[in-house]
C-alpha cells in the first residue's frame, strides 16, 4: 500500500491526462483526487499507465466507493477491470448491457477469467433470466459460454434466446445440458419448415428423444455422421435399421467407419443381422437370425 505523503507543489492533477504517465506511485496517490478519477475514468484507457500505477488508481476508487463502484464508473473501467477481484465485482450492480459489453471487450481474446465469470453471474442474476440480447453478447465474446452453465442455470434461458445460439456455441456441451436446451430449441423453431428446421435444430439434437429422431427420419433430412455420433445412445437404440437409413440418407455409408464407437456399436448389437445386411455395408455384430429378442424394458414397465 502506498504511504500517505503530501502532493509536491505544482503536481496536483487537474485532469486525468498523459502528464500522469511518469508520476511515481506515491505521487499518483497524493496528487490525483479520487472524485476526479471517477468522473474521468474513460480517459484512463487512453493513457499508458503501468501495472503498478493502475494498482494505485484502483486503490483510490476503492477508498471512494467502499461499498462497490457505481455503474457510471464501472462502464468506463477499461483496463482497470483486469485489476478487479471477484470479491470487488460481487459488490457491483451491473444492469446495462452496454456496461457488460464494455468490460467483456477489455478481456477479449483471453480465456474467461474468474472476474468475467463473476461479472456475468452478477449481470444475469440481476436480470432474472438469460434474455436473447444478453446471450447474443455473451456467446459473441465466449462461444463456449452456454456450455459452462449448469442444467439448472440453463433452465432459465427462454426459448426466444435460442435464436442467438450458433452451432459452435454448443461444441463443449454435455448431454445433460443438451437435454435442457433441446426442448427449448424445438419450441423456438417449431414454425419453420422441414429443411430450415433441421438446419437450426441439428446442433441441439444431442438432447433429442427417440420419437423426435423417428419423426426426423420421415423428412429426408440426410443427417451427417458427426451429428449422429452425438445423439443420445438411449435415443438411438430403439431406431430400426430402416429409420436410421432414412435419417442418414447418403451418409449411411459412414456407419461402417464408426461401427466400433458409441452409439453405432450399441445400436448394431440391438439390430437383427439380416436387417443390417440389407444396408450392404458389412456391419457385423447384430442378433443372429432365429434368435428371439425380448424387450426387457417393456417387461419391466408392465410389471
Amino acid at each position: 500500500e502506498v504511504e500517505k505523503t503530501a502532493c509536491p507543489s505544482g503536481k496536483k492533477a487537474r485532469e486525468i491526462d498523459e502528464s500522469l504517465i511518469f508520476y511515481k506511485k506515491w505521487e499518483l496517490e497524493a496528487c490525483v483526487d479520487a472524485a476526479l478519477l471517477a468522473t474521468q475514468m474513460d480517459r484512463v484507457n487512453a493513457i499508458p499507465f503501468t501495472y503498478e500505477q493502475l494498482d494505485v488508481l484502483k486503490h483510490k476508487l476503492d477508498e471512494l466507493y467502499p461499498q462497490g463502484y457505481p455503474e457510471s464508473v464501472i462502464q468506463h473501467l477499461g483496463y482497470l477491470f483486469l485489476k478487479m477481484s471477484p470479491e470487488d465485482i460481487r459488490k457491483w450492480n451491473v444492469t446495462s448491457l452496454e456496461t457488460l459489453k464494455a468490460l467483456l471487450e477489455v478481456n477479449k481474446g483471453h480465456e474467461m477469467s474468474p472476474q468475467v465469470a463473476t461479472l456475468i453471474d452478477r449481470f444475469v442474476k440481476g436480470r432474472g433470466q438469460l434474455d436473447k440480447d444478453t446471450l447474443d453478447t455473451l456467446t459473441a465474446f465466449y462461444p463456449g459460454y452456454l456450455c459452462s452453465l449448469s442444467p439448472e442455470e440453463l433452465s432459465s434461458v427462454p426459448p426466444s434466446s435460442i435464436w442467438a445460439v450458433r452451432p459452435q456455441d454448443l461444441d463443449t456441451c454435455d448431454p445433460r445440458q443438451l437435454d435442457v436446451l433441446y426442448p427449448k430449441a424445438r419450441l423456438a423453431f417449431q414454425n419453420m419448415n422441414g429443411s430450415e428446421y433441421f438446419v437450426k435444430i441439428q446442433s441441439f439434437l444431442g438432447g433429442a428423444p427417440t420419437e423426435d429422431l423417428k419423426a426426423l427420419s420421415q423428412q429426408n433430412v440426410s443427417m451427417d455422421l458427426a451429428t449422429f455420433m452425438k445423439l443420445r445412445t438411449d435415443a438411438v437404440l430403439p431406431l430400426t435399421v430402416a429409420e436410421v437409413q432414412k435419417l442418414l440418407g447418403p451418409h449411411v455409408e459412414g456407419l461402417k467407419a464408426e461401427e466400433r464407437h458409441r452409439p453405432v456399436r450399441d445400436w448394431i448389437l440391438r439390430q437383427r443381422q439380416d436387417d443390417l445386411d440389407t444396408l450392404g455395408l458389412g456391419l457385423q455384430g447384430g442378433i443372429p437370425n432365429g434368435y428371439l429378442v425380448l424387450d426387457l424394458s417393456m417387461q419391466e414397465a408392465l410389471s
Epitope: 507543489s9 505544482g10 498523459e18 502528464s19 511515481k24 499508458p48 499507465f49 503501468t50 503498478e52 483496463y79
Partner: antibody, heavy 119, light 106 residues
Amino acid sequence: EFQLQQSGPELVKPGASVKISCKTSGYSFTDYNMNWVKQSNGKSLEWIGVINPNYGTTGYNQKFKGKATLTVDQSSSTAYMQLNSLTSEDSAVYYCARGGYDGEAMDYWGHGTSVTVSS
Amino acid sequence: QIVLTQSPAIMSASPGEKVTMTCSASSSVNYMHWYQQKSGTSPKRWIYDTSKLASGVPARFSGSGSGTSYSLTISSMEAEDAATYYCQQWSSYPPTFGGGTKLEIK
C-alpha cells in the same frame, strides 16, 4: 540477460516512411513501458513517446505527434516505431528504452537505429 | 515544457580529481535522472531518482539536488569516466533531457 535488439540502419528518401523495430528478450515484455528517444547527429536526446505493451496505449511528445506512431507485437515481444513524411530533420539515431519500475528512469536501452533521409 | 540546462558543456579532469557537473531546471522537478553515453554507444542509466546509483555504477559517483538545481559528482576521476552525461526529468510532461556535459580526461 535483458536485451533490446533494434533493426539495422535505414537510408530513405524524403517523403517516405520507415518502420524500425525493437525486439526484447530476458524479461516480461508486457510488464514494462517502452520509450523511444531521438538523438540527432551526436547532439542531445529528445523523448518521442511511450507505449504500454500490455494494452497498446500510447503517450507522445507533442512535437512528434503525427510524425511517429508506436505499436507493439506481443507475440514476438517487439516494439515498433513508424516515422512518416520524412525530411532531413528526421535524420538521427533512434533508441528504444525500457521504462524502469515506478518511474526509475529508462533502465535498458537498445543499441540504436540510424535513419538517414537523403535524396 | 521544462528546459534542463547542463553546465559546463565541456570539461576535463585529471585522474584522481573531484568532478562536479550541474543540471538546472526551468521549473521545479521532484527527481533527476542521469545517463552516461560513450561515443558510438547507447546511453546507460547511471543515476536515477536523484541519488540512486544504477547497477554496476562505481561508488565514486553520487547525485544530489532538489527543486531546480541538481548535480552529479565523481569523487575521484578515472579514465573510464570520460563520457557525455545527460540529465533527464519526467516530473513534468513531456520528459526532457539536458544538453549534456562532455567530460574528458586530461
